[in-house]
């Protein structure tokens, strides 16, 4: 029912320009890796890589953060950079890869009963697109981040993956971010071989789960590299 969907659902990713969709074997319709929202940069293939400019972390992918590419660089020139792995230096949570957070300047695992210090954060949608609520309520969503007992369940609004329960990540859904399932073996994933090459997806997928990597499907061969289907596969 609609109520159960409103309570429990999540969103992943949308189709590319025509010809970029890769059909899932046996499927009547396409499974595909990403489309840009109006105003986003052009859909780019891996070979046509350009750094994706950003103003804040939320404009980048789940495994990226927004910063100046050079230390002490011009603050006006920021791009999406690869997230920092465990034990790497950091200045804020968003710099650390999913499943980690920034503690005392170092990325550490968020499994260690970490609770963010902020009491409340507000998501304001301002992407130049119209956002109407179905029930007429405010477009501004206040997200309580004081998650001492529960973390966001599937479909809950989030700011970053540490807001979400185990097995979920925080990924874009239209012009918000919600908790979505981390991908399992065999599921279609979005491959960003070069950071920032993805543009900004309306429906963003989570990353592949532990022990899995996003790789081209062995039996899926097409002329265009950008249109090949990627799935989560065992290392």
């Amino acid at each position: 029912t609609l109520n159960s969907v409103l309570n429990s659902n999540a969103i992943k990713n949308l189709p590319p320009p025509l010809g970029g969709a890769a059909g899932h074997p046996g499927s009547a319709v396409s499974a595909a890796p990403g489309i840009l929202y109006p105003g986003g940069n052009k859909y780019q293939t891996i070979d046509n890589y350009q750094p994706y400019p950003c103003a804040e972390d939320e404009e980048c992918g789940t495994d990226e953060y927004c910063a100046s590419p050079t230390r002490g660089g011009d603050a006006g020139v920021q791009i999406c950079l690869a997230c920092r792995k465990r034990r790497k230096r950091c200045m804020r949570h968003a710099m650390c890869c999913p499943g980690n957070y920034c503690k005392n300047g170092i990325c550490v695992s968020s499994d260690q009963n970490h609770f963010r210090g902020e009491i409340e954060e507000t998501i304001t949608e301002s992407f130049g697109n119209d956002h109407s609520t179905l029930d007429g309520y405010s477009r501004r969503t206040t997200l309580s981040s004081k998650m001492y007992h529960t973390k966001g369940q599937e479909g809950s609004v989030c700011l970053r993956s540490s807001d979400c329960a185990s097995g979920l990540c925080c990924a874009r859904h239209f012009w918000s971010k919600i908790c979505k399932p981390v991908l399992k073996e065999g599921q279609v994933c979005t491959k960003h071989r070069r950071k920032g090459s993805h543009g900004l997806e309306i429906f963003q997928r989570c990353y592949c789960g532990e022990g899995l990597s996003c790789r081209i499907q062995k039996d899926h061969h097409q002329a265009s590299n950008s249109s090949r289907l990627h799935t989560c596969q065992r290392h």
Epitope: N9, K12, N13, L14, L134, H173, I178, F203
Partner: nanobody
């Protein structure tokens, strides 16, 4: 297997209206949101309007705001696009897209909308 079927396209004069429908069949799982996209000849596919069951919101591209209305019934696996005050620049193939809980993203084959001046 999931199938998305769009209908309602056609030839209409500028200023006219059309109502597109998209029905999903064969679904054994839930949709989290659906959207309409369009692709004009020689152009990239672009977002037109979307509806999020999860967040209870609708979304529109600036170019269609105030003219197009998206609606839907998740229980019936159906989404609609009411297009009023159509312009020649709205001419395109319109695609319906559905985002599903099985982690695949499904979308249909498209329906042609032609607006003559």
């Amino acid at each position: 297997e999931v199938q998305l079927v769009e209908s309602g396209g056609g030839l209409v004069q500028a200023g006219g209206s059309l109502r597109l429908s998209c029905a999903a069949s064969g679904r054994t799982f839930s949709s989290y949101g659906m959207g309409w996209f369009r692709q004009a000849p020689g152009k990239e596919r672009e977002f037109v309007a979307g509806i999020s069951w999860t967040l209870g919101r609708t979304y529109y591209a600036d170019s269609v705001k105030g003219r197009f209305t998206i609606s839907g019934d998740n229980a019936k696996n159906t989404v609609y696009l009411q297009m009023n005050s159509l312009k020649p620049e709205d001419t395109a193939v319109y695609y319906c897209a559905s985002d599903e809980s099985d982690a695949y993203n499904y979308w249909g084959q498209g329906t042609q909308v032609t607006v003559s001046s």
